[in-house]
Each structure stands twice: as structure tokens, then as C-alpha cells.
């Protein structure tokens, strides 16, 4: 039975040209995290594997940095980076948990962070 929940940074906004940290946190389970995938819509950005470490998609290497922790840092943001991002936690023995973050990249300097929220 999957008892865990994924807490994410929720709906967030950031300024064009700036950077943002995408963070998810798995709680309420003792399951072991074996791998975390970061995806933008259907595109794989990066994987952090417990045994093998980080692998960043070469096409994003210049703008994506691993961490902090299991999170992902997006740099040199453009308006095209606006959209949904997913953290996919592979765990043993529970299975897969998915968290969603919506990022809006703003032209202006008025970029406010949304509230944290949970996905059961």
C-alpha cells in the first residue's frame, strides 16, 4: 500500500533570465527512493539514480543543474520554460509517486512564489 505523499513547491513564477529551484519532497512513507526523474511535459530533463548519480539530458546541460538534494535548478529562464514540470519518484517497495509543479516565467520583475501544496 502506498502511504506516501509528495510535497512540491507548487505553482511558482520567476523572472526571465533568472533561475529557479524545482523541489519535491516525499513524506509519510519509509520506502527507499531508488530514482527521481524530472520531466517537462513529455521531455526528460534529468534523472538522479541512487546508485549511479545524476544524468542531465545533454540538450539541457547548459541550463539545468542538479540539486539541491533531489531537486533541480533551471537557469537562464526563457518564456518557453513556462509550463508543467513533474518529479517522478521511484521507490521500493511502494512504487512510483509523482509531483507536479507549474512554472510561469514572467517578462516583468514581479515574480512571486506560489504556496506549497501536496499531491497524495
Amino acid at each position: 500500500m502506498m502511504t506516501g505523499t509528495i510535497e512540491t513547491t507548487g505553482n511558482i513564477s520567476a523572472e526571465k533570465g533568472g533561475s529557479i529551484i524545482l523541489q519535491c519532497h516525499l513524506s509519510s512513507t519509509t520506502a527507499q527512493v531508488t530514482q527521481v526523474n524530472w520531466e517537462q511535459q513529455d521531455q526528460l530533463l534529468a534523472i538522479c539514480n541512487a546508485d549511479l548519480g545524476w544524468h542531465i539530458s545533454p540538450s539541457f546541460k547548459d541550463r539545468v543543474a542538479p540539486g539541491p538534494g533531489l531537486g533541480l535548478t533551471l537557469q537562464s529562464l526563457t518564456v518557453n520554460d513556462t509550463g508543467e514540470y513533474f518529479c517522478i519518484y521511484h521507490t521500493y517497495p511502494d512504487g512510483t509517486y509523482t509531483g507536479r509543479i507549474f512554472l510561469e516565467v514572467l517578462e516583468s520583475s514581479v515574480a512571486e512564489h506560489g504556496a506549497r501544496f501536496q499531491i497524495p
Epitope: 549511479l52 544524468h55 521511484h90 521500493y92 512504487g95 512510483t96
Partner: antibody, heavy 117, light 107 residues
Framework: DVQLQESGPGMVKPSQSLSLTCTVT?????????WHWIRHFPGNKLEWMGF???????KYNPSLKSRISITHDTSKNHFFLKLNSVTSEDTATYYC??????????WGTGTTVTVSS | DIQMTQSPASLSASVGETVTITCRAS??????LAWYQQKQGKSPQLLVN???TLAEGVSSRFSGSGSGTQFSLKINSLQPEDFGSYYC?????????FGAGTKLELK
Amino acid sequence: DVQLQESGPGMVKPSQSLSLTCTVTGYSITSGYDWHWIRHFPGNKLEWMGFISDSGSTKYNPSLKSRISITHDTSKNHFFLKLNSVTSEDTATYYCARGSYWYFDVWGTGTTVTVSS
Amino acid sequence: DIQMTQSPASLSASVGETVTITCRASENIYSYLAWYQQKQGKSPQLLVNNAKTLAEGVSSRFSGSGSGTQFSLKINSLQPEDFGSYYCQHHYGNPLMFGAGTKLELK
């Protein structure tokens, strides 16, 4: 087009070290991907040995960890395998390969290494 | 270690036939499985990654399926260039492991 080519001695004596070079052309080894060594034994078994990432971090097969070292020379776009204390069991065809998310999308042509006195 | 069990070890088939090779993982590897083809005296070539994604330039006669612990590679309408050895490999943890291979021979 990215190409990989292994080079090194075809014969190594038992207890000595095996050293191989992988020359990468058509792609910079610091621009992404991981860079792996894999060997193919005469009985047809394939064994993954380890890799060096574009940033220089390494991961090794635990069965080889005490004997293996993978390094790179980014100025020459080469990466290297060193395997210490070889025995006849290390006789194999050695391949270097490019790794994308830990599967291998480009392979070298392979070089056969025989361990014999 | 995650063990990969491939079957059959060898297979004889004729041009035009359809064949299926299977691979079983000793534990859940989700969809992190690759398939390679190797011809005599040549290096392996990637056919499929992530269980079902066909590598660039690979014929659509090849198809991969499965998830969890059970996977298969299907080759439709066998062509002369398809004969050789096939290997599965999980790309999920350390050590990365290959199956023992399937030798596909012309009947």
C-alpha cells in the same frame, strides 16, 4: 557523427595492468553523456565495467571496484581504462561506449585483449 | 544485483517469419530496459531503450514491450540482416547488467 575508437596493447601479462584509451571524435566528452567501458568475454557474456561522466565523476561495477580506474583527458577528448592485477579471466574484447541515461547509444569498434604469459 | 534472464538462448527462423525474444529482470526495473543487436565480429548496436523507444535509424520491424520484470523484443518479417545475437540490458542501477544473449540463426 560521433565515433569512438579503442586502442591499447593486445597482450598483457598476468598480474600486470591493462591500460586502454578511447578516442572520441565528433563530440566533446565534456558536453554531456557518460563515457563507459564494457567488455565481451569469449563465452559471449557482456559485462559493464564503469563510466566517467562529462564532469569527471566515476562509477564502477562493484565486482571490479578494487581494480579499476577510469579517467579522462578533456584536452585530447580521450578517456581511459586501467585495470590492475589482471588474470586470464580478463581476456575479452573491450569496448568504449557513450551512455545516455545508462544505456549505450554509440559503441567503439572494440579491441581484443589477451592476458597470457 | 539485478539479474537479467534472457530466453531462448538460441533460435532458428526463416526469412519472413516473426520472432520474439524475452528478458526477465529479477526485480522491478520499471521500463528501464534496452535491447542491442550484435553481428559477428561487430560491436553491439542499440535497438530499443526504455523498453519500447526505437533507437534512431532502427527498422520499425523491431518493437519492444513490457515493464516491471517482463520484457520482450519482437522482430516482424525477418530479413537476412537481422540474424545475429541480441542482448537485453537494464539501465536502472549499479551494476548495469546484460542478459546472456539470444543467438538468432537462419533455419
